[in-house]
């Protein structure tokens, strides 16, 4: 008789999840010499231990503590790039500007990027059928708690000038409910962060508006200023040219505004 299984509203665990995490870990540690000491089997065991046999609506940051410890990685604190709703461009940027880091350029972020996972209470099974949706089911699910945990710690590590890439095509360029707006902004440490610099990425070819004057950007500026961190904002009118100029800064067309 098939056992009754809880049906959640979100997609189930990504197929071949254990193999994917292990393979990503091996690949990352091969490419990054400073992480060669990492035992990927232990990393997988710690990852698994965070959610297997636990109710997928009852996950805590402490569940991920062993994984966080194993994935400890010193990121240059003044080279951190945060992003909100514009992941692909942020990643294209750090692939070119190799000395800057998004969360997904770290081992822990790389392991989990674009994956979904959850288990079931009191069984060692991974649930490939469905996982809790943050809105429809519960917020303390394995995926949401993981990203909240690593995002908080990533923001805590930042110092000096922190950059954030924001999507100027969205109705809310700064969204208080995004991971950036609800977690990272509030965990920048004023004792060591001097400035948050927002890069607002324009979508339209002929969009010459100053999106730094957008009401949601003003809201971000207000939140940041109240935390005793300075705020600055730049429009990136042509993201394609922006990337090209990061690749070839000596190009004569790169002296004009991008």
């Amino acid at each position: 008789v098939p056992r009754w299984r809880q049906q959640w509203s979100g997609p189930g665990t990504t197929k071949r999840f254990p193999e994917t995490v292990l393979a990503r870990c091996v690949k990352y540690t091969e490419i990054h010499p400073e992480m060669r000491h990492v035992d990927c089997q232990s990393v997988w065991d710690a990852f698994k231990g965070a959610f297997i046999s636990k109710h997928p609506c009852n996950i805590t940051e402490e569940d991920y503590q062993p994984l966080m410890k194993l994935g400890t990685q010193t990121v240059p604190c003044n080279k951190i790039l945060l992003w909100s709703r514009i992941k692909d461009l942020a990643h294209q940027f750090t692939q070119v500007q190799r000395d800057m880091f998004t969360l997904e350029d770290t081992l822990l972020g790389y392991l989990a990027d674009d994956l979904t996972w959850c288990g079931e209470f009191n069984t060692s099974k991974i649930n490939y059928q469905s996982c809790p949706d943050w809105r429809k089911d519960c917020s303390n699910n394995p995926v949401s708690v993981f990203w909240k945990t690593v995002s908080r710690r990533f923001a805590e590590a930042a110092c000096d000038v922190v950059h954030v890439m924001l999507n100027g095509s969205r109705s809310k360029i700064f969204d208080k409910n995004s991971t950036f707006g609800s977690v990272e902004v509030h965990n920048l440490q004023p004792e060591k962060v001097q400035t948050l610099e927002a890069w607002v990425i324009h979508g339209g070819r002929e969009d010459s508006r100053d999106l730094c004057q957008d009401p949601t950007i003003k809201e971000l500026e207000s939140i940041i200023s109240k935390r005793n961190i300075q705020f600055s904002c730049k429009n990136i009118y042509r993201p394609d040219k922006f990337l090209q100029c990061v690749k070839n800064p000596e190009d004569s067309s790169c002296t004009s505004e991008i």
Partner: nanobody, 119 residues
Framework: QVKLEESGGGLVQPGESLRLSCSAS???????????MSWYRQGPGKQRELVAS???????TYAESVKGRFTISRDNAKNTAYLQMDSLKPEDTAVYYC??????????WGQGTQVTVSS
């Protein structure tokens, strides 16, 4: 210069108490509160083992062998973590090491302090 310095070790009799302190200094600890602080120990001829830890949110965990006898705490204003050790036993004899860990800042160790429990 990053420095974790343990103090408070010594020779005591079984049943007595000791309080270990771990003081963190250096620019990396400018925001000490975000670090998870832990105490490890290494007994003669044994592997290093976790004794107790306290997260940035002040959640504590203990090794089974010390539960109810040891208490970990922290004073973020003083950049210091403590290990209160009561009802000490001969098997608690070890070098005790302080560890400060933050996922994206680093993993730092002290030099250790000797604790000897003997009658």
């Amino acid at each position: 210069q990053v420095k974790l310095e343990e103090s408070g070790g010594g020779l005591v009799q079984p049943g007595e108490s000791l309080r270990l302190s771990c003081s963190a200094s250096g620019s990396i600890f400018k925001v000490f509160r975000v670090f998870a602080m832990s105490w490890y120990r290494q007994g003669p001829g044994k592997q290093r083992e976790l004794v107790a830890s306290i997260s940035s949110g002040e959640t504590t965990t203990y090794a089974e062998s010390v539960k109810g006898r040891f208490t970990i705490s922290r004073d973020n204003a003083k950049n210091t973590a403590y290990l209160q050790m009561d009802s000490l036993k001969p098997e608690d004899t070890a070098v005790y090491y302080c560890n400060a860990d933050h996922t994206f800042t680093g993993d730092f160790w002290g030099q250790g302090t000797q604790v000897t429990v003997s009658s």
